[in-house]
Interface confidence: medium
């Protein structure tokens, strides 16, 4: 599923991401935009043999199990395919674990490069939340 901007903002808010660990909703929507272009079925392969999955491009080396990433830790204890569902529950729950891990949203390269320090509130402007 490819979410609309406000549709995703509403879904993320419903799942408790607004101000989760101090990160406003705009940060999460911005991250999703630049990680996956709001596409729940996005997959991207990395040079270390891992793959990033879903709307928040969660990595199989650390967070999920795709059955083929060497040394996978699967810290979210889920199959990576669950992160590709049109229901973002699994991605959100895993993202909450990631953002609580010490580096906050710096874990997402796209957030660090494209969202951090910008007017992230613009990503939810005009949305009925």
């Amino acid at each position: 599923k490819v979410f609309g901007r406000c549709e995703l903002a509403a879904a993320m808010k419903r799942h408790g991401l607004d101000n989760y660990r101090g990160y406003s909703l705009g940060n999460w929507v911005c991250a999703a935009k630049f990680e996956s272009n709001f596409n729940t079925q996005a997959t991207n392969r990395n040079t270390d043999g891992s793959t990033d999955y879903g709307i928040l491009q969660i990595n199989s080396r650390w967070w999920c199990n795709d059955g083929r990433t060497p040394g996978s830790r699967n810290l979210c204890n889920i199959p990576c395919s669950a992160l590709l569902s049109s229901d973002i529950t699994a991605s959100v729950n895993c993202a909450k674990k990631i953002v609580s891990d010490g580096n906050g949203m710096n874990a997402w390269v796209a957030w660090r490069n494209r969202c951090k320090g910008t007017d992230v509130q613009a990503w939810i402007r005009g949305c009925r939340l």
Epitope: Q41, T43, G49, G67, R68, T69, P70, P79, S81, L84
Partner: antibody, heavy 116, light 107 residues
């Protein structure tokens, strides 16, 4: 136990297309990548590409882009590979395998012969 | 693409001999190297994963070693059922690639 059952041998004419199937049993089909491998005598094994059935995500070896197309039907736990514009170079045994990085589980292979 | 070069192309041995098969990668692939055996008209069978881990049900006479670019599959005291083709495969990056194979034949 995990099993991959491929469709039977095919004899096709040059220029035609063929669709090979791979039915998976014994595991959660949507969770693992299905990979396709080509074997020709004297050419060893070649990785064609892969599909994640749960999402339909696909990756192709550059060499096979435009030649192979992967699809999957999660209702029947079956992956498909279509080969188009067949030539004699496509005559080979084609395997599906479960993508664990390594390949512990293989189909029995589908022999494709392209001949006029 | 990562190229895998296997040597020798053919190995003629007598049952009871011990042999070593080589697989060399064109660049470092850590331990992401797997070995297969294939008999005529059969699918490949996984022997060793991640350079040195024996797959389920594989006899202990098969062992693997190596890391980086140089890998070895060793068969201690070859048995008649071990004859066939042996392939290595890397899963360090895409596209996945295979070696050209080593044929183990009876002398």
């Amino acid at each position: 136990q995990v099993q991959l059952q491929e469709s039977g041998a095919e004899v096709m004419k040059p220029g035609a297309s063929v669709k090979i199937s791979c039915k998976a049993t014994g595991y959660t089909f949507t969770t693992y990548w299905i990979e396709w491998v080509k074997q020709r005598p004297g050419h060893g094994l070649e990785w064609i590409g892969e599909i994640l059935p749960g999402s339909g995500s696909t990756y192709y070896n550059e060499k096979f882009k435009g030649k192979a197309t992967f699809t999957a039907d999660t209702s029947s736990n079956t992956a498909y590979m279509q080969l188009s514009s067949l030539t004699s170079e496509d005559s080979a045994v084609y395997y599906c395998a479960r993508g664990d990085g390594w390949y512990c589980y293989w189909g029995q292979g589908t022999t494709l012969t392209v001949s006029s | 693409d990562i190229e895998l070069t296997q040597s020798p192309a053919t190995l003629s041995v007598t049952p009871g001999d011990s042999v070593s098969l080589s697989c060399r990668a064109s660049q470092s692939i850590s331990n992401n190297l797997h070995w297969y055996q294939q008999k005529p008209h059969e699918s490949p069978r996984l022997l060793i994963k991640y350079a040195s881990q024996r797959a389920s049900g594989i006899p202990s006479r098969f062992s693997g070693s190596g890391s980086g670019t140089d890998f070895t599959l060793s068969i201690n005291s070859v048995e008649t059922e071990d004859f066939g083709m042996y392939f290595c495969q890397q899963s360090n990056s895409w596209p996945r690639t295979f070696g050209g194979g080593t044929k183990l034949e009876i002398k």
